[in-house]
Protein backbone atom coordinates (compact mmCIF):
# COMPACT_ATOMS: atom_id res chain seq x y z
CA UNK A 1 0.00 0.00 0.00
CA UNK A 2 0.97 3.40 -1.31
CA UNK A 3 2.03 5.27 2.00
CA UNK A 4 -0.25 8.66 3.03
CA UNK A 5 1.96 11.90 3.71
CA UNK A 6 -0.24 13.98 5.88
CA UNK A 7 0.31 18.06 6.61
CA UNK A 8 -0.22 18.85 9.98
CA UNK A 9 -2.08 21.73 10.71
CA UNK A 10 -1.90 22.10 14.44
CA UNK A 11 0.76 23.60 16.71
CA UNK A 12 1.31 23.11 20.50
CA UNK A 13 4.74 24.43 20.88
CA UNK A 14 4.41 27.44 23.25
CA UNK A 15 7.96 28.26 22.59
CA UNK A 16 8.40 27.55 18.66
CA UNK A 17 12.55 26.39 17.78
CA UNK A 18 13.58 27.88 14.57
CA UNK A 19 13.44 24.66 13.00
CA UNK A 20 11.41 21.74 13.86
CA UNK A 21 12.31 18.11 12.82
CA UNK A 22 9.24 16.48 10.32
CA UNK A 23 8.38 13.17 11.31
CA UNK A 24 9.90 10.71 8.57
CA UNK A 25 8.80 10.47 5.26
CA UNK A 26 9.00 8.95 1.77
CA UNK A 27 10.79 10.99 -0.68
CA UNK A 28 11.97 10.96 -3.98
CA UNK A 29 15.07 13.78 -5.04
CA UNK A 30 13.90 16.20 -6.54
CA UNK A 31 13.52 16.12 -10.43
CA UNK A 32 13.05 12.45 -9.99
CA UNK A 33 9.63 10.70 -10.35
CA UNK A 34 7.70 8.81 -7.76
CA UNK A 35 6.09 5.27 -9.06
CA UNK A 36 4.97 2.90 -6.09
CA UNK A 37 7.73 2.25 -4.89
CA UNK A 38 10.53 3.48 -7.33
CA UNK A 39 12.50 6.87 -7.76
CA UNK A 40 12.52 7.27 -11.60
CA UNK A 41 14.99 9.80 -13.59
CA UNK A 42 14.69 9.55 -17.14
CA UNK A 43 18.02 11.15 -18.70
CA UNK A 44 17.80 14.15 -21.18
CA UNK A 45 20.77 13.55 -23.26
CA UNK A 46 22.02 9.92 -24.88
CA UNK A 47 24.94 7.72 -24.13
CA UNK A 48 25.72 4.30 -25.25
CA UNK A 49 24.47 1.55 -22.37
CA UNK A 50 27.90 1.44 -20.22
CA UNK A 51 27.72 4.76 -20.23
CA UNK A 52 23.95 5.06 -18.98
CA UNK A 53 24.95 2.16 -16.38
CA UNK A 54 27.76 4.24 -15.21
CA UNK A 55 25.57 7.51 -14.75
CA UNK A 56 22.58 6.09 -12.89
CA UNK A 57 26.21 4.59 -10.07
CA UNK A 58 27.06 8.01 -10.16
CA UNK A 59 23.65 8.97 -9.10
CA UNK A 60 23.51 6.59 -6.41
CA UNK A 61 20.94 4.45 -7.99
CA UNK A 62 21.11 2.04 -11.17
CA UNK A 63 19.45 1.47 -14.02
CA UNK A 64 16.01 0.40 -14.38
CA UNK A 65 15.05 -2.93 -13.35
CA UNK A 66 11.50 -3.99 -14.41
CA UNK A 67 9.87 -6.71 -12.23
CA UNK A 68 6.79 -7.39 -14.24
CA UNK A 69 4.69 -6.31 -17.10
CA UNK A 70 2.76 -3.91 -15.18
CA UNK A 71 6.00 -1.84 -14.07
CA UNK A 72 6.66 -2.13 -17.47
CA UNK A 73 3.48 -0.28 -18.23
CA UNK A 74 3.31 2.17 -15.61
CA UNK A 75 6.73 2.91 -16.69
CA UNK A 76 5.49 2.78 -20.23
CA UNK A 77 2.81 5.64 -19.54
CA UNK A 78 5.46 8.40 -18.22
CA UNK A 79 6.88 7.89 -21.81
CA UNK A 80 5.42 11.26 -23.74
CA UNK A 81 7.03 10.65 -26.84
CA UNK A 82 6.29 7.29 -29.18
CA UNK A 83 9.88 7.78 -30.94
CA UNK A 84 11.78 8.22 -27.78
CA UNK A 85 13.93 5.10 -26.45
CA UNK A 86 15.43 4.51 -23.09
CA UNK A 87 18.00 2.11 -22.09
CA UNK A 88 16.92 -0.12 -19.20
CA UNK A 89 19.27 -2.61 -17.30
CA UNK A 90 18.95 -5.97 -19.25
CA UNK A 91 21.72 -7.12 -21.27
CA UNK A 92 22.39 -9.97 -23.11
CA UNK A 93 24.95 -12.56 -21.36
CA UNK A 94 26.85 -14.34 -23.68
CA UNK A 95 28.43 -17.28 -21.39
CA UNK A 96 25.09 -17.93 -20.03
CA UNK A 97 23.21 -17.26 -23.65
CA UNK A 98 20.38 -15.22 -21.60
CA UNK A 99 19.28 -12.38 -20.55
CA UNK A 100 20.42 -10.42 -17.29
CA UNK A 101 19.43 -8.41 -15.38
CA UNK A 102 22.24 -5.96 -13.51
CA UNK A 103 21.54 -7.19 -10.01
CA UNK A 104 22.61 -10.56 -11.45
CA UNK A 105 18.63 -12.13 -12.07
CA UNK A 106 17.57 -13.39 -15.15
CA UNK A 107 15.26 -12.27 -17.39
CA UNK A 108 11.80 -14.93 -16.32
CA UNK A 109 10.20 -15.91 -19.91
CA UNK A 110 6.94 -14.41 -19.31
CA UNK A 111 8.44 -11.21 -18.24
CA UNK A 112 8.90 -9.07 -20.94
CA UNK A 113 8.73 -9.76 -24.54
CA UNK A 114 11.78 -8.23 -26.01
CA UNK A 115 12.13 -7.92 -30.02
CA UNK A 116 15.10 -8.27 -31.61
CA UNK A 117 18.15 -10.02 -31.24
CA UNK A 118 19.24 -12.25 -28.66
CA UNK A 119 23.22 -11.86 -29.33
CA UNK A 120 26.73 -10.67 -27.89
CA UNK A 121 26.62 -6.89 -27.10
CA UNK A 122 22.64 -6.36 -27.02
CA UNK A 123 21.01 -4.25 -24.61
CA UNK A 124 17.57 -3.76 -23.83
CA UNK A 125 15.23 -0.21 -24.23
CA UNK A 126 12.22 0.29 -23.90
CA UNK A 127 9.48 2.62 -25.65
CA UNK A 128 6.03 3.64 -25.18
CA UNK A 129 4.73 0.83 -26.71
CA UNK A 130 7.39 -1.75 -27.20
CA UNK A 131 10.66 -3.56 -25.40
CA UNK A 132 13.89 -3.97 -28.13
CA UNK A 133 17.07 -5.34 -28.35
CA UNK A 134 19.80 -3.00 -29.78
CA UNK A 135 23.87 -2.97 -29.67
CA UNK A 136 24.82 -1.78 -26.40
CA UNK A 137 27.16 0.85 -28.33
CA UNK A 138 23.86 2.69 -29.56
CA UNK A 139 23.32 6.27 -27.78
CA UNK A 140 19.88 6.80 -26.30
CA UNK A 141 18.56 8.08 -23.49
CA UNK A 142 18.22 5.67 -20.24
CA UNK A 143 16.33 5.66 -17.02
CA UNK A 144 17.83 5.25 -13.65
CA UNK A 145 16.26 4.21 -10.25
CA UNK A 146 16.22 4.02 -6.68
CA UNK A 147 14.15 2.78 -3.89
CA UNK A 148 12.20 5.45 -2.25
CA UNK A 149 14.19 6.24 1.28
CA UNK A 150 13.38 7.82 4.31
CA UNK A 151 14.27 11.14 4.32
CA UNK A 152 14.46 13.04 7.53
CA UNK A 153 13.47 16.87 6.48
CA UNK A 154 14.35 19.64 8.57
CA UNK A 155 11.59 22.36 7.77
CA UNK A 156 10.40 25.24 9.38
CA UNK A 157 6.89 24.42 11.27
CA UNK A 158 4.99 27.33 9.02
CA UNK A 159 5.81 25.48 6.46
CA UNK A 160 3.95 21.93 7.87
CA UNK A 161 0.62 24.08 7.19
CA UNK B 1 17.18 29.73 -34.55
CA UNK B 2 16.68 25.81 -35.21
CA UNK B 3 18.81 25.06 -38.50
CA UNK B 4 21.61 23.23 -40.34
CA UNK B 5 23.44 25.05 -43.03
CA UNK B 6 25.37 23.06 -45.54
CA UNK B 7 28.76 24.20 -47.84
CA UNK B 8 31.19 22.60 -50.17
CA UNK B 9 29.65 21.47 -52.76
CA UNK B 10 30.35 22.17 -56.60
CA UNK B 11 31.71 20.88 -60.22
CA UNK B 12 34.63 18.47 -59.48
CA UNK B 13 35.77 16.21 -62.01
CA UNK B 14 35.32 12.10 -61.76
CA UNK B 15 38.22 11.03 -59.19
CA UNK B 16 38.01 14.04 -58.06
CA UNK B 17 37.29 15.06 -53.72
CA UNK B 18 35.34 17.28 -52.02
CA UNK B 19 34.82 17.77 -48.46
CA UNK B 20 30.97 18.92 -47.79
CA UNK B 21 30.31 20.70 -43.99
CA UNK B 22 26.87 21.20 -42.33
CA UNK B 23 26.90 23.88 -39.48
CA UNK B 24 24.13 23.06 -36.82
CA UNK B 25 22.78 25.87 -34.39
CA UNK B 26 19.72 26.28 -32.18
CA UNK B 27 19.87 22.37 -30.66
CA UNK B 28 22.04 20.50 -28.60
CA UNK B 29 23.92 18.87 -31.37
CA UNK B 30 25.95 16.60 -29.38
CA UNK B 31 22.50 14.65 -28.39
CA UNK B 32 21.85 13.85 -31.91
CA UNK B 33 22.66 11.05 -34.69
CA UNK B 34 23.19 12.88 -38.09
CA UNK B 35 23.09 11.78 -41.30
CA UNK B 36 24.10 12.86 -44.84
CA UNK B 37 21.20 11.46 -48.12
CA UNK B 38 21.46 12.87 -51.71
CA UNK B 39 19.30 13.45 -54.07
CA UNK B 40 20.50 13.09 -57.78
CA UNK B 41 18.57 15.44 -60.11
CA UNK B 42 14.80 14.55 -60.84
CA UNK B 43 15.20 11.40 -59.17
CA UNK B 44 14.52 10.18 -55.19
CA UNK B 45 16.02 10.12 -51.84
CA UNK B 46 19.45 7.81 -51.01
CA UNK B 47 20.57 7.45 -47.66
CA UNK B 48 24.59 8.11 -47.69
CA UNK B 49 25.89 8.08 -44.09
CA UNK B 50 24.95 8.84 -40.39
CA UNK B 51 27.64 9.13 -37.41
CA UNK B 52 26.35 8.46 -34.07
CA UNK B 53 26.08 11.58 -31.02
CA UNK B 54 30.05 10.87 -29.53
CA UNK B 55 31.25 9.90 -32.98
CA UNK B 56 31.98 6.52 -31.89
CA UNK B 57 29.06 4.72 -34.23
CA UNK B 58 29.39 5.04 -38.13
CA UNK B 59 27.48 3.55 -41.20
CA UNK B 60 27.69 3.64 -44.35
CA UNK B 61 25.51 2.90 -47.45
CA UNK B 62 27.37 0.44 -49.90
CA UNK B 63 27.68 3.08 -52.85
CA UNK B 64 29.96 5.21 -51.07
CA UNK B 65 31.49 2.74 -48.77
CA UNK B 66 35.63 3.16 -48.78
CA UNK B 67 34.90 6.53 -51.18
CA UNK B 68 33.23 8.32 -48.37
CA UNK B 69 33.69 9.50 -44.87
CA UNK B 70 31.69 11.38 -42.43
CA UNK B 71 32.51 12.94 -39.47
CA UNK B 72 31.71 15.69 -36.79
CA UNK B 73 33.14 18.08 -34.29
CA UNK B 74 31.12 18.52 -31.58
CA UNK B 75 33.08 21.91 -30.28
CA UNK B 76 32.19 23.44 -33.59
CA UNK B 77 28.64 22.15 -34.01
CA UNK B 78 29.96 20.67 -37.56
CA UNK B 79 28.76 17.42 -39.33
CA UNK B 80 31.42 16.88 -42.37
CA UNK B 81 31.45 14.49 -45.39
CA UNK B 82 34.73 13.72 -47.11
CA UNK B 83 34.26 12.31 -50.40
CA UNK B 84 36.89 10.72 -52.63
CA UNK B 85 37.15 8.80 -55.65
CA UNK B 86 34.48 10.92 -56.72
CA UNK B 87 31.77 9.69 -59.72
CA UNK B 88 29.27 10.68 -61.97
CA UNK B 89 26.72 9.05 -60.43
CA UNK B 90 27.80 10.63 -56.90
CA UNK B 91 26.19 14.00 -59.23
CA UNK B 92 23.02 15.03 -56.48
CA UNK B 93 22.09 17.23 -53.77
CA UNK B 94 23.81 16.66 -50.22
CA UNK B 95 21.24 16.95 -47.47
CA UNK B 96 22.50 17.17 -43.69
CA UNK B 97 19.83 16.04 -41.74
CA UNK B 98 19.08 15.26 -38.12
CA UNK B 99 17.64 12.54 -36.65
CA UNK B 100 14.66 12.85 -33.89
CA UNK B 101 16.47 12.37 -30.86
CA UNK B 102 16.99 8.91 -28.70
CA UNK B 103 15.39 6.60 -31.39
CA UNK B 104 18.56 5.09 -31.52
CA UNK B 105 19.79 3.46 -35.06
CA UNK B 106 16.50 3.69 -36.01
CA UNK B 107 16.56 7.17 -38.09
CA UNK B 108 13.64 9.26 -38.53
CA UNK B 109 14.84 12.66 -40.25
CA UNK B 110 12.95 15.11 -38.64
CA UNK B 111 15.49 18.44 -39.85
CA UNK B 112 16.90 19.05 -43.32
CA UNK B 113 19.17 21.65 -44.58
CA UNK B 114 18.59 23.25 -48.00
CA UNK B 115 21.20 21.11 -49.21
CA UNK B 116 24.79 21.29 -51.64
CA UNK B 117 24.59 20.57 -54.94
CA UNK B 118 27.53 18.16 -55.95
CA UNK B 119 28.19 17.82 -59.57
CA UNK B 120 30.97 14.82 -61.05
CA UNK B 121 31.52 15.71 -64.58
CA UNK B 122 34.80 16.18 -66.70
CA UNK C 1 18.57 -4.40 -48.24
CA UNK C 2 14.88 -3.44 -47.84
CA UNK C 3 12.75 -2.46 -50.66
CA UNK C 4 10.07 0.01 -50.40
CA UNK C 5 7.39 0.20 -53.42
CA UNK C 6 5.12 3.24 -53.24
CA UNK C 7 1.95 3.19 -55.15
CA UNK C 8 0.36 5.03 -56.87
CA UNK C 9 3.16 7.11 -58.78
CA UNK C 10 1.24 9.80 -59.24
CA UNK C 11 -2.39 10.87 -58.22
CA UNK C 12 -3.84 13.94 -59.60
CA UNK C 13 -6.58 15.05 -56.73
CA UNK C 14 -8.55 18.18 -56.19
CA UNK C 15 -8.75 20.19 -53.22
CA UNK C 16 -11.29 18.96 -50.53
CA UNK C 17 -10.41 15.31 -51.71
CA UNK C 18 -9.28 12.40 -49.28
CA UNK C 19 -5.85 10.95 -50.55
CA UNK C 20 -4.57 7.30 -49.91
CA UNK C 21 -0.95 6.69 -50.68
CA UNK C 22 0.25 3.17 -49.89
CA UNK C 23 4.34 2.06 -49.31
CA UNK C 24 5.17 -1.99 -48.85
CA UNK C 25 8.32 -3.51 -47.82
CA UNK C 26 9.95 -5.70 -49.08
CA UNK C 27 9.97 -7.50 -45.54
CA UNK C 28 8.62 -6.62 -42.10
CA UNK C 29 9.77 -3.43 -40.82
CA UNK C 30 7.19 -4.08 -37.49
CA UNK C 31 6.30 0.14 -37.67
CA UNK C 32 10.05 1.50 -38.01
CA UNK C 33 8.17 3.78 -41.23
CA UNK C 34 8.44 7.77 -42.05
CA UNK C 35 6.60 9.78 -44.28
CA UNK C 36 8.20 12.63 -45.51
CA UNK C 37 6.73 15.44 -48.02
CA UNK C 38 8.67 17.61 -50.51
CA UNK C 39 8.28 20.50 -52.63
CA UNK C 40 10.11 21.31 -55.77
CA UNK C 41 13.37 23.02 -55.13
CA UNK C 42 13.06 22.47 -51.23
CA UNK C 43 14.24 19.76 -48.21
CA UNK C 44 11.85 16.78 -47.81
CA UNK C 45 9.83 17.74 -44.47
CA UNK C 46 8.89 14.93 -41.82
CA UNK C 47 5.13 14.05 -41.48
CA UNK C 48 4.66 11.10 -39.45
CA UNK C 49 7.08 8.71 -37.10
CA UNK C 50 6.92 5.13 -36.49
CA UNK C 51 4.37 4.38 -38.99
CA UNK C 52 1.42 6.86 -37.07
CA UNK C 53 3.61 9.04 -34.86
CA UNK C 54 2.16 12.81 -36.19
CA UNK C 55 5.45 15.02 -36.14
CA UNK C 56 4.76 17.97 -34.26
CA UNK C 57 3.65 21.14 -36.07
CA UNK C 58 1.99 18.86 -39.04
CA UNK C 59 -1.54 19.28 -39.68
CA UNK C 60 -3.74 16.67 -37.93
CA UNK C 61 -5.58 16.03 -41.67
CA UNK C 62 -1.77 14.03 -42.32
CA UNK C 63 -2.82 9.91 -40.68
CA UNK C 64 -0.40 7.17 -41.46
CA UNK C 65 -1.37 3.71 -40.45
CA UNK C 66 0.24 0.42 -40.63
CA UNK C 67 2.36 -2.35 -39.50
CA UNK C 68 5.09 -5.16 -40.90
CA UNK C 69 4.77 -4.95 -44.75
CA UNK C 70 2.02 -2.22 -45.63
CA UNK C 71 1.66 0.73 -44.77
CA UNK C 72 -0.88 3.77 -45.45
CA UNK C 73 -0.51 7.80 -45.85
CA UNK C 74 -3.78 9.20 -46.05
CA UNK C 75 -4.26 12.98 -46.21
CA UNK C 76 -8.40 13.24 -45.28
CA UNK C 77 -9.02 16.91 -46.67
CA UNK C 78 -6.74 17.96 -49.44
CA UNK C 79 -5.57 21.41 -49.50
CA UNK C 80 -3.59 23.88 -51.65
CA UNK C 81 -0.50 23.52 -50.30
CA UNK C 82 -0.34 19.89 -49.89
CA UNK C 83 0.23 19.30 -53.77
CA UNK C 84 3.97 17.77 -53.50
CA UNK C 85 5.85 14.67 -53.79
CA UNK C 86 5.33 11.97 -50.77
CA UNK C 87 8.01 9.63 -49.53
CA UNK C 88 8.38 6.55 -47.49
CA UNK C 89 11.22 5.46 -45.38
CA UNK C 90 12.21 2.69 -43.40
CA UNK C 91 14.24 2.91 -40.33
CA UNK C 92 15.09 -0.71 -39.14
CA UNK C 93 18.17 -0.23 -36.72
CA UNK C 94 20.61 -2.25 -39.23
CA UNK C 95 21.28 0.16 -42.31
CA UNK C 96 20.71 1.40 -45.21
CA UNK C 97 17.88 3.16 -44.61
CA UNK C 98 15.40 2.95 -47.84
CA UNK C 99 13.08 5.21 -49.16
CA UNK C 100 10.13 4.43 -51.55
CA UNK C 101 10.89 6.01 -55.47
CA UNK C 102 7.88 8.74 -54.36
CA UNK C 103 4.57 9.57 -55.30
CA UNK C 104 3.73 13.00 -56.84
CA UNK C 105 0.03 14.60 -56.00
CA UNK C 106 -0.79 16.54 -58.70
CA UNK C 107 -3.69 19.19 -59.17
CA UNK C 108 -6.43 17.30 -61.45
Known amino acids: QKPSIGKCSVDIQQNRTKTTERPDLLNCPIYWQQVQEKCLLFSHTVNPWNNSLADCSTKESSLLLIQDKDELTRTQNLIHDKAISFWIGLNFSLSEKNWKWINGSFLSSNDLKITGDAKENSCVYISQTSVYSEYCSTEMKWICQKELTLVRNKVSPDSWL | QVQLVESGGGLVKPGGSLRLSCAAS????????MSWIRQAPGKGLEWVSY????????AYADSVKGRFTISRDNSKNTLYLQMNSLRAEDTAVYYC???????????????WGRGTLVTVSS | DIQLTQSPSSVSASVGDRVTITCRAS??????LAWYQQKPGKAPKLLIY???GLQSGVPSRFSGSGSGTDFTLTISSLQPEDFATYYC??????????FGGGTKVEIK
Open chain 2, 97 to 111: ARSLMATGTHLYFDL
Open chain 2, 26 to 33: GFTFSDYY
Open chain 2, 51 to 58: ISPSGATI
Open chain 3, 27 to 32: QGISSW
Open chain 3, 50 to 52: AAS
Open chain 3, 89 to 98: QQSTSFPPYT
